[in-house]
């Protein structure tokens, strides 16, 4: 019977972690099995930044220093699995640590929403859909924004309702609007850690329409219609 080296369950192990993770946090783990059933001892090789430690028995990997995404991501180290006893044969795999942005970007509108309008006078309450985004990286799911009106005085005229994690609907509460531009402030919260909030403005014009477009004197561009 020829003694064989331990076998890792994966050629490369990958983990993703926020760059502001607390020291001592488990950032990943590796697993190997020995064909002869011997115990395995795990060790790290090439941890030149001194960021990591591995539990020799379980293969769990922990941070032991502040992680800095500016130093370069992914951070790659080798993981060694060695037989305990026997011939002390070993195998090598890799552990890649991908450092994610902290939640440091407030939500904002995903597009330029200038040019929104309703034809005046409104024959029935109207609504429009808008989309929010931020510049953070989102793991397992997309952003999960919540939406509300930016000031209490708007609540007589407008309401905002969430459609999904990135889209919401702005609706008029009545039809008695003047023929002018209204600036509607929307508060968008990202629900992150820490939660960040952005207040954005949606300019909405109530205007006389010609063939479904906002009538403007010569030299003005037509606005985009939403209902």
């Amino acid at each position: 019977d020829v003694n064989e080296a331990p076998q890792f369950s994966q050629h490369v192990f990958q983990a993703k972690v926020s760059e502001d993770v607390a020291i001592g946090t488990k950032v990943g783990n590796v697993t190997a099995k020995d064909p002869e059933g011997l115990d395995i001892s795990y060790s790290l090789r090439g941890d030149t930044r001194g960021w990591l430690k591995i539990d020799h028995v379980t293969g769990e990997i922990f941070s032991v220093a502040p992680l800095d995404r500016e130093a370069g991501s992914p951070y790659r180290v080798q993981v060694v699995a060695t037989e305990v006893g026997g011939s002390s044969l070993s195998s090598v795999s890799e552990f890649h640590l991908i450092l994610m942005d902290v939640n440091d970007n407030p939500p904002r509108l995903a597009k330029d929403y200038t040019g929104l309008f309703f034809c005046h006078p409104l024959s029935a309450p109207g609504s429009l859909i808008f989309e929010a985004t931020d510049d953070d990286q989102h793991l397992f799911r997309g952003p999960h924004f919540t939406f509300s009106l930016g000031s209490g005085s708007l609540q007589n005229d407008w309401e905002v309702s969430k459609i999904n994690g990135t889209h919401a609907r702005l609706s008029t509460r009545h039809t008695e609007f003047e023929e002018r531009e209204y600036v509607v402030l929307i508060r968008i919260n990202d629900g992150g850690r820490p939660p960040l909030e952005g207040i954005v403005s949606l300019p909405v014009t109530f205007c006389s329409c010609v063939e479904g477009s906002c009538f403007r004197p010569a030299g003005h561009k037509h606005h985009h219609h939403h209902h």
Partner: antibody
């Protein structure tokens, strides 16, 4: 064998958005990153970003942050790339490219999707 | 971001002769953690998608003819076509896959003299 099949050519007006799809087959979809690379006419290659289908983690090139959104539908093994606020400089061929085994070079490429931005 | 600089921009070589393309990185691409160089080479023929030739600076993709070889370490890398064939006329790109964001060289056009 690995195949990446992209959606067809698009013509868009400035300010609009475009959404390109890339359907993968021939491998375990969630085991490999998917990248998006673009190439303007007569120009070189530019990496836009990547998504890991296993957890939907995205990593975007800072140049495109705020304009690009990459999503994945694991039920159909399809990755999507949406680029908003289009301008004429975004006229390019957009490629999806699967990551390599155990690292991040581009081992397999889609056929490319031409996006033309013109008023 | 890591800047990749290729030279020359274009290259005309006789059939059967050696073609050499250089790629210089603004940062060291040799990982002290794994002792690998994270550099790849691609070939792109007119109207086609790029095709991977080399990764980890010197490992050939399966199916790539052995006349293509990659060498170098750290910041200086070379793609060599030992005996140029007609079908090798293309643009060649280097790419670093060491740190996000992944970046490409500007490309080298190889033609037949």
């Amino acid at each position: 064998q690995v195949q990446l099949v992209q959606s067809g050519a698009e013509v868009k007006k400035p300010g609009a958005s475009v959404k390109v799809s890339c359907k993968a087959s021939g491998y375990t979809f969630t085991d490999y990153w998917m990248n998006w690379v673009r190439q303007a006419p007569g120009q070189g290659l530019e990496w836009m970003g990547a998504i890991d289908p296993s957890d939907r983690y995205t990593n975007y090139n800072q140049k495109f942050k705020g304009r690009v959104t990459m999503t994945v539908d694991t039920s159909t093994s399809t990755v999507y790339m949406e680029l908003s606020s289009l301008r004429s400089e975004d006229t390019a061929v957009y490629f999806c490219a699967r990551g390599g085994y155990g690292d991040y070079w581009f081992a397999n490429w889609g056929q490319g999707t031409l996006v033309t931005v013109s008023s | 971001d890591i800047v990749m600089t290729q030279s020359p921009d274009s290259l005309a070589v006789s059939l059967g002769e050696r073609a050499t393309i250089n790629c210089k990185s603004s940062q060291n691409l040799l990982s002290s953690g794994t002792q690998k160089n994270y550099l790849a080479w691609y070939q792109q023929k007119p109207g086609q998608s790029p095709k991977p030739l080399i990764y980890f600076a010197s490992t050939r993709e399966s199916g790539v003819p052995d006349r293509f070889s990659g060498s170098g370490s750290g910041t200086d890398f070379t793609l060599t076509i030992s005996s140029l064939q007609a079908e090798d006329v293309a643009v060649y790109y280097c790419q670093q896959h060491h740190y996000f964001p992944w970046t490409f060289g500007g490309g080298t056009k190889v033609e037949i003299k």
